[in-house]
């Protein structure tokens, strides 16, 4: 692999990371917008930080940091930055794989935990504005009502529920959506993992090439 290959590798890594950095900026920006303008509220009282805005801000920030390391490491041919980029991608990849395995193994436990959290939040609907905002947003957006159905609202469905007839529950609808789109979710997840592995491979190859080039030049 010569100087031309090194240049190609360097610019491929740079441009792809620049693209991801821009995406990260957009995600972060959207997250900040949600935090400022849209009060989707808090659905799980035991996880008050788990809001749509916070999720976007965290994901956007991680993408930006990783992509920045990739951009700067490749364009400056900085081994330290490239290794940091490689290690961060490895940590993210391992975390994703671990999370996927845990979700698969503990799906039933997770379902029970989420259902319990949602039941608790239904009881807080009339007393907590943040919970009310969260439920109203979800019920209006998904055209659903309650957890498993309209009857979950034992003291009557709120105005955000479809009023004319009973509809399926929001959790039931979300689970159904996930199950019916399982193939697409799987493909997207695999694509993300492949991109991460490619990024790691490129970073490692570029790192090795920097070493070889340095030796060839006699540094």
């Amino acid at each position: 692999m010569g100087m031309s290959s090194l240049k190609l590798l360097k610019y491929v890594l740079f441009f792809f990371n620049l693209l991801f950095w821009i995406c990260g900026c957009c995600i972060l920006g959207f997250g900040i917008y949600l935090l400022i303008h849209n009060n989707f509220g808090v659905l799980f009282h035991n996880l008050p930080s788990l809001t749509l805005g916070n999720v976007f801000v965290i994901v956007g920030s991680i993408i930006m940091v990783v992509a920045f390391l990739g951009c700067m490491g490749s364009i400056k041919e900085n081994k330290c930055l490239l290794m940091s980029f490689f290690i961060l991608l490895l940590i993210i990849l391992l975390a994703e794989v671990t999370l996927a395995i845990l979700l698969f193994v503990y799906e039933q436990k997770l379902n029970e935990y989420v259902a319990k959290g949602l039941t608790d939040s239904i009881h807080r609907y009339h007393s907590d504005n943040s919970t009310k905002a969260a439920w109203d947003s979800i019920q209006s957006f998904l055209q659903c009502c309650g957890i498993n159905g309209t009857s979950d609202w034992t003291s009557g469905p709120p105005a955000s529920c479809p009023s004319d007839r009973k509809v399926e529950g929001c959790y039931a609808k979300a689970r159904l959506w996930f199950h019916s789109n399982f193939l697409y979710i799987g493909i997207i997840t695999i694509c993300v993992c492949v991109i991460e592995v490619l990024g790691m491979s490129f970073a490692l190859t570029l790192n090795c090439q920097i070493d070889k080039t340095s030796q060839t030049i006699g540094l």
């Epitope: 209006s140 055209q143 309209t150 009857s151 003291s155 009557g156 105005a159 479809p162 004319d164 009973k166």
Partner: antibody, heavy 111, light 112 residues
């Protein structure tokens, strides 16, 4: 389909309980509504019940006048009307899912 | 309560031609979820009412596709493309956005 109880002829001041039995579907799957139609007039929504949890809602006009109940074991809903006057002379329909209407129960209040 | 307004009678129509029945509400019947909660019912002489159109434009099961519903948030129209003798009766619009649900006074379809 929805099968309603037969015509009722009652005295003013009395109470009456109308029934509505469903067949071919489970009433728990949607609301049961009751609708009033006075002779040669339009339709008025009395109220509804969610048979799955017993929750009821009434139009303000019928609050205190009407009581809606249900029995899921017999797939039946009920409408009880109290302190009857000539104004209560009407046909009462039970409705499920807004798709299924009973044949109507004629209530005549007269002395 | 949301008041629903309807004309008592339609313009007399000839069998086989189209007819339109109008209905209006004093406030928008469109929910935050984008659905417009306007229903149409037909009550034939001596019968119980039955559902024709739900949520403004959806045809109820078993209803011929001669019937169609349209409208904005406050003004609604029921169209019958080719009127048949069995379409005679009183047409009621109803709002299902807020409790108490309210019906229009009904429009009687007249045949020439």
């Amino acid at each position: 389909q929805l099968q309603q109880s037969g015509a009722e002829f009652v005295r003013p001041g009395a109470s009456v309980k109308l029934s509505c039995t469903a067949s071919g579907f489970n009433i728990k799957d949607d609301y049961i509504h009751w609708v009033k139609q006075r002779p040669e007039q339009g339709l008025e929504w009395i109220g509804r019940i969610d048979p799955a949890n017993g929750y009821t809602e009434y139009a303000p006009k019928f609050q205190g006048k009407a009581t809606i109940t249900s029995d899921t074991s017999s797939n039946t809903a009920y409408l009880q009307l109290s302190s009857l006057t000539s104004e209560d002379t009407a046909v009462f329909y039970c409705v499920w899912h807004w798709d299924y209407w009973g044949q109507g129960t004629t209530l005549t209040v007269s002395s | 309560d949301i008041v629903m307004t309807q004309a008592a009678f339609s313009n007399p129509v000839t069998l086989g031609t189209s007819a339109s029945i109008s209905c209006s509400s004093y406030k928008s019947l469109q929910h935050n979820n984008g659905i417009t909660y306007l229903y149409w019912f037909l009550q034939r002489p001596g019968q119980s009412p039955h559902l024709l159109i739900y949520r403004m434009s959806n045809l109820a099961s078993g209803v011929p596709d001669r019937f169609s519903g349209s409208g904005s948030g406050t003004d609604f129209t029921l169209r019958i493309s080719r009127v048949e003798a069995e379409d005679v009766g009183v047409y009621y619009c109803a709002q299902m956005l807020e409790r108490p649900f309210t019906f229009g006074t009904g429009t009687k379809l007249e045949i020439k």
